[in-house]
Amino acid sequence: GVFNYETETTSVIPAARLFKAFILDGDNLFPKVAPQAISSVENIEGNGGPGTIKKISFPEGLPFKYVKDRVDEVDHTNFKYNYAVIEGGPIGDTLEKISNEIKIVATPDGGSILKISNKYHTKGDHEVKAEQVKASKEMGETLLRAVESYLLAHSDAYNEQKLISEEDLGGEQKLISEEDLHHHHHH
């Protein structure tokens, strides 16, 4: 079956800036600002667009070692990001996949609203544990607040962007600011 859970949360960060940091550069930021939640993000294949596969590794103490995500859509204009958890943990046993949609909407006060949809595609008659839904929501909140805190502390980061290619970033092209580049050289 398919079980859909929707949630909304707010941020004081403007939508465009939050999209750049939280979505487009989350692979870099999450292990740095929330190492208790994500230890590393590795690009397995693709360049960040649809079809890209990422391996998200979890720190010691969490029940599963990693999951793999597949990017399904990146809409830079409407600040939309769709991806699916396709491997690792319970995927392949009780769950076929978890499809996620994130849309960041600008608010009149200069902040933003994140609209999040999580669709759990279960195998057979398996149901989704309430604890799983809660954990997913809490993890999203943890990552968001960690990124938000980082952006508030680094007011120049993820504003005026340049597309650069750096060996220090694994040779991949990344959206990054001059001030952020300094941090990455020492990361």
Epitope: E60, G61, L62, P63, K65, P90, I91, E131, A135
Partner: antibody, heavy 123, light 108 residues
Framework: EVQLVQSGAEVKKPGESLKISCSGS????????IAWVRQMPGKGLEWMGL????????RYSPSFQGQVTFSVDKSINTAYLQWSSLKASDTAMYYC????????????????WGQGTLVTVSS | DIQMTQSPSSLSASVGDRVTITCRAS??????LNWYQQKPGKAPKLLIY???SLQSGVPSRFSGSGSGTDFTLTISSLQPEDFATYYC??????????FGQGTRLEIK
Amino acid sequence: EVQLVQSGAEVKKPGESLKISCSGSGYRFTNYWIAWVRQMPGKGLEWMGLIHPDDSDIRYSPSFQGQVTFSVDKSINTAYLQWSSLKASDTAMYYCTRQDGILWSHNAWFDPWGQGTLVTVSS
Amino acid sequence: DIQMTQSPSSLSASVGDRVTITCRASQSISSYLNWYQQKPGKAPKLLIYAASSLQSGVPSRFSGSGSGTDFTLTISSLQPEDFATYYCQQSYSTPPITFGQGTRLEIK
């Protein structure tokens, strides 16, 4: 059906080596950590550590570090626990169990469990 | 390491009784607490995960509660097959994962 099946009981002499096995079926073996748990006669459960079948990553409990060795053969969905030189104090029931839990949280538990392998070390 | 202390270590009860077993952690473990049942000569079996969630296939007479440092396992109406040893286990701070010392439930 998700299950773990362990090798049979062993009787050994002090100083001998031993390798016992735990075979998983009914689930994606490489997605889950396998834990080993010791239960000495008439005593409680002691967590020995974990091994991840995907890449053989190992976490030993400090109490068992250097005393035992974990290994895995993911091609046959089997984990192993071994001793290079057994002692009388290694006499116990040894269980393997799958670490399950809630993704993105610290909620972790053990289910299912193997039937246990009784190891007796006596001269 | 987080220490888990169960009480009582053993108790006697009769069929139909309501029984409560407690587990105390040496520091807060949120709700990351599980309960297992072990019958003589058998492997442990998961009863309750995440402090209060009943594992699939476990009778509803078993329930769990608590958060932080204090947790309870309750059997609302004891059945003959419930006489066993019960263990709590924390997964908040690992390694190592730690179990309580066990509570032996005997027939009065």
